[in-house]
């Protein structure tokens, strides 16, 4: 039998000799030559050798654990003389022994993390990794310390874990928002002679919000003539934050003051600023000043950071109306009027009203202003600024109708007031699906029944535009003696499929089907679309090989287009039947 | 799975008024034209009333119009019937059925009934 | 308004027998006609839209034809879930009508 333990090699071995491994044995060796050794499988003759006659292994390679940690191989002994095995072929290991030839590795070679400025000492920043080659069953090659190299005192590492945390409190992004940590990593435990990695941690400082809103200035003053019509800006003010984002956000409001209900702050989102606007018509003769306490806040405190004071500032506005003849003021700013798209001419959609608001109070006429009515479409009653249609609408044509109507004094021409009214027309199911695209294709002469040979899709024009729900089906004319049947799937699409085992292009070398398309919409709408269908010659994959070469030719007037209704015209067989077209009616 | 579920029905007296709902599952409610149909207990079916799937136009069968009004919220994919001066004879099973033409989808129906 | 007319009011079959309701229309309706089955107390369902197509989920035994004003609804084996009131129904012209049914009882 075969005398050995498993063999144990070092990696990485230096030495001029070839390293020796150790002996293959059989007890049958009387050590007189009669025996020959021969080894097999992993790097046998290249990396590792056998003396064969006395089954002495030697590695003549230097080998590295990490590339290859074991090799399998096998051991034969046969008797010279015979040729024959004096043992059977045995598998053997030859395990490749590990030294720390391997520095630990960082997963990457730059970090990026965040930390809330502010943040409590240990918070968890980020976890870094290295990870070691070497073997981590044997010896210390392979435990990795973490420690930090530069970014103190601001954050410390777990030695075992890689976790950064913060090590200093109050760090204020304000005064500083970028850090650069170096970390560490070092093999054998941290211990002397241990191979080490280096890795970058760039910390930024993320936001937190510690910093309240100030006006620059005490008092504000603006002037506003008093048509200012509501939602007019009257001027602008301005809190600043050291903070950023959304814990720079400021939201402004009127605290106090004798213009409360006369006057709005609201914020431009993207300025910050506080826009003051006038909330309600204005009146010279009745007030000239307004003083408002406008405040601006934080709207995104957090309560931690109250025992700084209070998230908040307030200033002192104040508004000065200037006197103006005025000219008239509608009610709205704005109309939005509908209508239906099937609306008669003469219907009324609505009506707008203006008046002088001067003492004087002059009447006033109405007028559409016909730079934005080209087309006459509408018209407005001049006396009691009634809108009425004057022509046919159409919404698939036009959805909104943005026309101007102008109030005039009739005392005073040259005082008018302009309000835009948004007429919306509303959809009437006034359109029928048709095919989404000019259908023509072919069947194969040795088709088999229920070939599917096209799918068809429709559209249609009316609302909803993606909602619709569509059925096909063959025009009744059609239907009875027809070569094809349609499948609707019900899906929004149908499928044409042949209705027979094989067709002759010689006897009949198009087909034209009506297909009927309709909606689910109220009134259904439907309409007619014509597939042109031409019997061809094909390989056995199916393929179009050469259909009939005459082109297809129609009567003036015919088309076989999406949506085309054919109908019968005396002399129109003869000219189909010609071209060997199959008339469906 | 679609669902229709009406609700709202009950007794009430000539000249009164009832609001029917039929609240819409399982599909695309803003999509499809919804209608109303009545059946007379012991009579066949009668066609009420249909609404467009945006809102926009409303159709209604003479003998109710003037009096009945359909609508519906989207948002809240449910369907209305308002039905004012109620008589006799509009003592039926009110379904509400999804599409505008054919009604591949009712509800289970709800019973008004105008009696003095 | 389009008068839709069912024909038998009623008819008695049994159990595997081919059953054939008709629907004539007072106009011609094109294609536009619908069938539709109700049983006692339950809302009625959708069999067949456009004439002749099949809703989905309804058994291939129900089949429709025709066009113009002469509609038919064949059953071709009667089974046991098939008792019930069949309606016709035209969408080519408001107001929509319906036929006045047609039950379907047992022999």
């Known amino acids: 039998s075969w005398m050995w333990n498993q063999f144990f090699l070092l990696e990485e071995y230096t030495g001029s000799d070839y390293q020796y491994v150790g002996k293959l044995h059989s007890d049958q060796d009387r050590g007189d030559g009669s025996l020959k050794y021969i080894l097999s499988g992993d790097g046998a003759g290249d990396l590792f050798i056998i003396n064969e006659n006395t089954g002495d292994i030697q590695a003549t390679k230097r080998l590295d654990r990490e590339e290859k940690p074991v090799y399998i191989l096998r051991a034969q002994a046969i008797n010279r003389r015979t040729g024959r095995p004096v043992e059977p072929e045995s598998e053997f290991i030859i395990k490749i022994h590990d030294i720390n030839d391997n520095e630990p590795i960082f997963t990457k070679d730059v970090y990026t993390a965040t930390v809330p400025e502010m943040a409590d000492v240990g918070t968890f920043v980020v976890q870094v990794t290295a990870t070691d080659a070497d073997d981590p069953t044997y010896g210390n090659s392979a435990k990795v310390v973490y420690s930090i190299l530069q970014g103190q005192p601001y954050f410390s590492v777990e030695s075992e874990t890689g976790i950064i945390k913060t090590a200093l409190l109050n760090m204020d992004r304000e005064n500083r928002e970028q850090y650069q940590v170096v970390i560490q990593a070092k093999d054998m435990g941290g211990q002397m002679g241990g191979l080490s990695g280096t890795t970058t941690v760039n910390i930024t400082l993320t936001d937190v919000n510690d910093n309240p809103p100030r006006f620059p200035q005490s008092t504000y003053q603006f002037k506003t003539p008093e048509s200012s019509p509501p939602g007019t800006p009257i001027g602008r003010i301005k809190a600043s934050d050291a903070d950023v984002g959304e814990n720079a956000e400021i939201e402004y409001s009127i605290t106090d003051g004798e213009g409360h209900d006369m006057f709005d702050v609201i914020t431009d989102q993207e300025t910050q600023e506080g826009i003051i606007t006038v909330k309600k018509l204005l009146d010279f003769e009745k007030k000239r000043v307004y003083t408002l306490k406008v405040e601006a806040s934080n709207p995104h405190i957090e309560p931690r950071f109250l025992y700084l004071g209070p998230f908040k500032d307030s200033a002192t506005v104040r508004i000065v109306v200037d006197d103006v003849d005025e000219p008239p003021v509608f009610s709205k700013l704005a109309y939005i009027l509908q209508i239906r798209e099937d609306a008669q001419i003469n219907t009324t959609i609505g009506s707008v009203a203006a008046q002088d608001p001067d003492a004087a109070r002059n009447p006033v006429k109405y007028s559409v202003d016909r730079h934005t009515d080209m087309d006459r479409i509408f018209n407005i009653d001049s006396g009691n600024g009634s809108i009425f249609t004057s022509k046919l609408l159409d919404r698939e044509t036009l959805l909104w109708h943005n026309i101007t109507v102008i109030a005039t004094e009739i005392n005073n021409p040259k005082q008018s007031s302009r309000v835009p009214l948004y007429i919306k027309v509303l959809d009437v199911n006034d359109n029928a699906p048709e095919f989404a695209e000019f259908y023509e294709t072919f069947v194969c002469e040795k088709a088999k029944a229920d070939q599917l040979i096209q799918t068809l899709h429709a559209v249609d024009k009316d609302d909803p535009y993606s909602g619709h729900q569509f059925s096909f089906s063959l025009a009744p004319e059609a239907a009875s003696g027809s070569n094809f049947t349609i499948q609707d799937n019900k899906d929004n699409t149908a499928g044409i499929l042949t209705r027979k085992n094989g067709y002759n292009r010689h006897e009949m070398s198009t087909y034209l089907l009506p297909v009927v398309i309709s909606d689910n919409d109220y009134p259904v709408q439907s309409s007619t679309g014509t597939v042109t269908v031409r019997v061809c010659a094909c390989d056995h994959h199916g393929n179009m090989q050469s259909c009939h070469a005459e082109a297809l030719i129609h009567p003036t007037g015919l088309s076989t287009g999406a949506g085309s209704e054919f109908r019968h015209d005396s002399g129109l067989n003869d000219i189909f039947e010609a071209q060997k077209i199959e008339w469906h009616e | 799975q679609v669902q229709l579920l009406e609700s709202g029905g009950g007794l009430v007296q000539p000249g009164g008024s009832l609001r029917l709902s039929c609240a819409a599952s399982?599909?695309?409610?803003?999509?499809?034209?919804m209608s109303w149909v009545r059946q007379a207990p012991g009579k066949g079916l009668e066609w009420v009333s249909v609404i467009r799937s945006s809102g926009s136009s409303t159709y209604y069968a003479d003998s109710v119009k003037g009096r009945f009004t359909i609508s519906r919220d989207n948002s809240k994919n449910t369907l209305y019937l308002q039905m004012n001066s109620l008589r006799a004879e509009d003592t039926a099973v009110y379904y509400c059925?999804?599409?505008?033409?054919?009604?591949?989808?009712w509800g289970q129906g709800t019973l008004v009934t105008v009696s003095s | 308004d389009i008068q839709m007319t069912q024909s038998p009011s009623s008819l008695s079959a049994s159990v595997g027998d081919r059953v054939t309701i008709t629907c004539r229309a007072s106009?011609?309706?094109?294609?536009?006609l619908n069938w539709y089955q109700q049983k006692p107390g339950k809302a009625p369902k959708l069999l067949i839209y456009a004439a002749s197509t099949l809703q989905s989920g309804v058994p291939s035994r129900f089949s429709g034809s025709g066009s113009g004003t002469d509609f038919t609804l064949t059953i071709s084996s009667l089974q046991p879930e098939d008792f019930a009131t069949y309606y016709c129904q035209q969408y080519y012209t408001s107001p929509y009508t319906f036929g006045q049914g047609t039950k379907v009882e047992i022999k």
């Open positions: 106009q011609s309706i094109s294609l536009w």
């Open positions: 399982g599909f695309t409610f803003s999509s499809y034209a």
């Open positions: 059925a999804r599409g505008g033409g054919y009604f591949d989808y």
